[in-house]
């Protein structure tokens, strides 16, 4: 079992439509064929799973379980997009990468990306 470095941006601001994107990059020490990526949210001391995907290197990244996440992979880089975010979802989003196969297993956990979400102001009523 080995540790692995995972890099992700420190801060990301979600768009007015509640979409946040960031890159999660891992320093793969071996030739992994099966990779599992999990996005976790930490708020206070509570850690919850946002989404997770297992993919074969070279194949499309598919988030199952009615996910609010989408993503693409390129080499040792995963481009993650989280949708449907609201102000209450502001928090630290951690990227966790596991090289599942072949052995040895590697685990890497990023330092987290602080995602700030600002709810858009409602449009004022128009007289026109």
């Amino acid at each position: 079992c080995k540790a692995m470095h995972v890099a992700q941006p420190a801060v990301v601001l979600a768009s007015s439509r509640g979409i946040a994107s960031f890159v999660c990059e891992y320093a793969s020490p071996g030739k992994a064929t099966e990779v599992r990526v999990t996005v976790l949210r930490q708020a206070d001391s509570q850690v919850t799973e946002v989404c997770a995907a297992t993919y074969m290197m070279g194949n499309e990244l598919t988030f199952l379980d009615d996910s609010i996440c989408t993503g693409t992979s390129s080499g040792n880089q995963v481009n993650l997009t989280i949708q449907g975010l609201r102000a209450m979802d502001t928090g630290l989003y951690i990227c966790k990468v596991e090289l599942m196969y072949p052995p040895p297993y590697y685990l890497g956990i990023g330092n987290g990306t602080q995602i700030y979400v600002i709810d858009p102001e409602p449009c004022p009523d128009s007289d026109f």
Partner: antibody
Framework: EVQLVESGGGLVQPGGSLRLSCAAS????????MSWVRQTPGKRLEWVAT????????SYPDSVKGRFTISRDNSKNTLYLQMNSLRAEDTAMYYC???????????????WGQGTLVTVSA | DIQMTQSPSFLSASVGDRVTITCRAG??????LAWYQQKPGKAPKLLIY???TLAEGVPSRFSGSGSGTEFTLTISSLQPEDFATYYC?????????FGGGTKLEIK
């Protein structure tokens, strides 16, 4: 209060099948990864299967892979374990467990049911 | 698979004693280790995760330490309700394996 209640255990012949159920209450079932863990008559604990929140991802040890299938019905707050081609060495108390994330961002078996006994014998 | 070895298998102690149980991992598991307590006829109960973090509601007389391959569970002052079997388990990769258990009995 978190409650997990297993059922479906019993006596089955080698080569037979059994389906275990675990009824969950006291928490939002669809928000948690769930697992089955068994305890042999010799009191050894062995992880048996894990399923993700929505059921899209499953994982098994080699000892049961291809014979056991974990599934869940989030609308019924119920976890299942379908066990086929049962062997004498599958005799055990089967527990369902809720997995929680700790500060290390890794799952732990945080809550366990009281178990259901499976006996495989001719 | 990562082998988890607990020692001792059996331990006799008295109320008020300080006891230590050891768990060794067959390879480096960093701090990804949990301890569980099981009483006769009951399900295991999570005591400690991440090697040293106490689970909710667990008394402070329980403590965990170690990292890498060597871990310990310490009970600072045994209470009558602590006589049970204790298991360690790694949560680093798959399969997640358990130690063989340590049965703590009244002397």
């Amino acid at each position: 209060e978190v409650q997990l209640v297993e059922s479906g255990g019993g006596l089955v012949q080698p080569g037979g099948s059994l389906r275990l159920s675990c009824a969950a209450s006291g928490f939002t079932f669809s928000s948690y990864t769930m697992s089955w863990v068994r305890q042999t008559p010799g009191k050894r604990l062995e992880w048996v299967a894990t399923i993700s929140r929505g059921g899209g991802y499953t994982s098994y040890p080699d000892s049961v892979k291809g014979r056991f299938t974990i599934s869940r019905d989030n609308s019924k707050n119920t976890l299942y374990l379908q066990m086929n081609s049962l062997r004498a060495e599958d005799t055990a108390m089967y527990y369902c467990a809720r997995e929680d994330y700790g500060s290390s961002y890794v799952h732990w078996f945080a809550y366990w049911g009281q178990g259901t006994l499976v006996t495989v014998s001719a | 698979d990562i082998q988890m070895t607990q020692s001792p298998s059996f331990l006799s102690a008295s109320v008020g004693d300080r006891v230590t149980i050891t768990c060794r991992a067959g390879e480096n598991i960093y701090s990804y280790l949990a301890w569980y307590q099981q009483k006769p006829g009951k399900a295991p109960k999570l005591l400690i995760y991440n090697a040293r973090t106490l689970a909710e509601g667990v008394p402070s007389r329980f403590s965990g330490s170690g990292s890498g391959t060597e871990f310990t569970l310490t009970i600072s002052s045994l209470q009558p309700e602590d006589f049970a079997t204790y298991y360690c388990q790694h949560h680093y990769g798959s399969p997640r394996t358990f130690g063989g258990g340590t049965k703590l009995e009244i002397k």
